[in-house]
Interface confidence: low
């Protein structure tokens, strides 16, 4: 299979080093020019570095140019992005790119999320948002879980282990004013079901390593 | 650097309609010794990578559907979608590879334009886990309504709230082309413990009249 | 995959001209600068000359100066090494080379495998 998969991203202080991986697989990847691309939460896309097929030629975004290091080891088919003296507006989602060798991303990786910053790993408190007749509107109860308080992104929700995706909504984190996340999953299932079926939200915050399933159940008076 | 400018910011377009997004540099990027723009689109859905869609600004990359065209020289560009399907929600790049520093435009948001859908309402009070924790979170879902603008007001014992609220909206859904939306009020527990009636109250173009869905701390 | 493939050398007699040329496949080379190297038996490859993108003109090797001219024709994806008044000390295998970059690196990723150019009476 023709992809790639970027990993070494997460929370580092400001000052502090980064080395990203490119892993490339499915295509012969010395033939390749490669690139790094940016993304700023919620921002566009940011051209960072390119290095030719042989790896004896680099270019830089001025952003950061004599901070960054792009590599290839054409042995291992991986790319490679050494960030230094990193700064808080370095933190983005990196994406690997294979380039056409024209200038153009024919392929892309799914990202790795690089965080500046001097705050500290935390992990999230999950609470659960219990279905209630408040809750409930024409035979559809709503029920979910509350993630909060955790840094830095991501976290990642699902219900039932995978099983649960109709009527899922996971929104956006937002960054409270104590500088840490917090997000809400809700689902939305047929009010009959509540006291038969089994609701469970799962919770993965990959970078304190928590993992968290809440079992989510109407309140008992 | 070449600047690359699109407009609009963000478009609403009907199912089956035809969008048109314009993609402007600051200098030509067509070679005249080949009549090659280096100029292509990109396509990223909510949470995924770009994808390549076209590249000399008119070729279409092989699996892109045919509705999907490009058009345009030098300076002026055109991505064309003859005819828009719920899944081409998602933002779209021009990007030129004239020259390095590669360059992209801004970003133009695509959603589909729909009728009016006016939410559902639901009102979570806090959890008792929560409370123990010593913080309150209160939480207000507007579920599948559209279009996105929608006002959400909290009450406390009929007293409104400022300040202490936060709000999260989804991505347009790729099926029904929905918005759904997460209010949250917090307190502290000593806060949350003084009032009684907690209630959002929902403004949206598909509601005759604000909806409040409210609850009675304490009670079930 | 990148190829060059050079193509027109021969044997010619000295004062005479060849023109050389370099077909590209896998790259449209309108954005990189194309360069031409030689290398005498039993001497270093060295640069002779390189036609930069469209517009950006020529540069050349001090000892072909005014004898050679190269040049360029995007559209066919190919550059061309004119070469006159020619001398036995232009006799060696020429390669082309194109730029790695956009930018003019001077470093290459892709080589040509030669042409021979005999200059002898």
């Known amino acids: 299979e023709v992809q790639l998969v970027e990993s070494g991203g997460g929370l580092v202080q400001p000052g502090g080093s980064l080395r990203l991986s490119c892993a490339a697989s499915g295509f012969t990847f010395n033939n390749y020019a490669m690139n790094w691309v940016r993304q700023a939460p919620g921002k566009g896309l940011d051209w960072v570095s390119t290095i030719s097929g042989s790896g004896g030629t680099t270019n830089y975004a001025d952003s950061v140019k004599g901070r960054f290091i792009i590599s290839r080891d054409s042995s291992k088919h991986t790319l490679y992005l050494q960030m230094n003296s990193l700064r808080a507006e370095d933190t983005a989602v990196y994406y690997c790119a294979k380039d056409s060798n024209w200038g153009n991303f024919d392929l892309w990786g799914r990202g790795t999320l690089v965080t500046v910053s001097s705050a500290s790993t935390k992990g999230p408190s999950v609470f659960p948002l219990a279905p209630s007749s408040k809750s409930t509107s024409g035979g559809t109860a709503a029920l979910g879980c509350l993630v909060k308080d955790y840094f830095p992104e991501p976290v990642t929700v699902s219900w039932n282990s995978g099983a649960l995706t109709s009527g899922v909504h996971t929104f956006p984190a937002v960054l409270q004013s104590s500088g840490l996340y917090s997000l809400s999953s809700v689902v939305t299932v047929p009010s009959s079901s509540l006291g038969t079926q089994t609701y469970i939200c799962n919770v993965n915050h990959k970078p304190s390593n928590t993992k968290v399933d809440k079992k989510v159940e109407p309140k008992s008076c | 650097d070449i600047v690359m400018t699109q407009s609009p910011d963000s478009l609403a377009v009907s199912l089956g309609e035809r969008a048109t997004i314009n993609c402007k540099s600051s200098q030509s990027v067509l070679y005249r010794s080949n009549n090659r723009n280096f100029l292509g689109w990109y396509q990223q859905k909510p949470g995924q990578p770009p994808n390549l869609l076209i590249y000399w600004a008119s070729t279409r990359e092989s699996g892109v559907p045919d509705r999907f065209s490009g058009s345009g020289s030098g300076t002026d560009f055109t991505l064309t979608i003859s005819s828009l399907q719920a899944e081409d929600v998602a933002v779209y790049y021009c990007q030129q590879y004239y020259t390095t520093p590669y360059t992209f435009g801004q970003g133009t948001k695509l959603e589909i334009k729909r009728t009016v859908a006016a939410p559902s309402v639901f009102i979570f009070p806090p959890s008792d886990e929560q409370l123990k924790s010593g913080t309150a979170s209160v939480v207000c879902l507007l579920n599948n309504f559209y279009p996105r603008e929608a006002k959400v007001q909290w009450k406390v014992d009929n007293a409104l709230q400022s300040g202490n609220s936060q709000e999260s909206v989804t991505e347009q859904d790729s099926k029904d082309s929905t918005y759904s939306l997460s209010s949250t009020l917090t307190l502290s527990k000593a806060d949350y413990e003084k009032h009684k009636v907690y209630a959002c109250e929902v403004t949206h173009q598909g509601l005759s009249s604000p909806v409040t869905k409210s609850f009675n701390r304490g009670e079930c | 995959q990148v190829q060059l493939q050079e193509s027109g050398g021969g044997l010619v007699q000295p004062g005479g001209s060849l023109r050389l040329s370099c077909a590209a496949s896998g790259r449209t080379i309108s954005r990189y600068a194309m360069s031409w190297f030689r290398q005498a038996p039993g001497k270093e490859r060295e640069f002779v000359a390189v036609?930069?993108?469209?517009?950006?003109?020529?540069f050349y090797a001090d000892s072909v100066q005014g004898r050679f001219t190269v040049s360029r024709d995007d559209a066919k994806n190919t550059v061309y090494l004119q070469m006159n008044s020619l001398k036995p000390e232009d006799t060696a295998v020429y390669y082309c080379?194109?730029?790695?970059?956009?930018?003019?690196?001077?470093?290459?990723?892709?080589w040509g495998q030669g042409t021979q150019v005999t200059v002898s009476s």
């Open positions: 036609a930069r993108r469209s517009g950006d003109g020529a």
């Open positions: 080379a194109i730029d790695s970059d956009t930018f003019y690196s001077g470093s290459y990723d892709y």
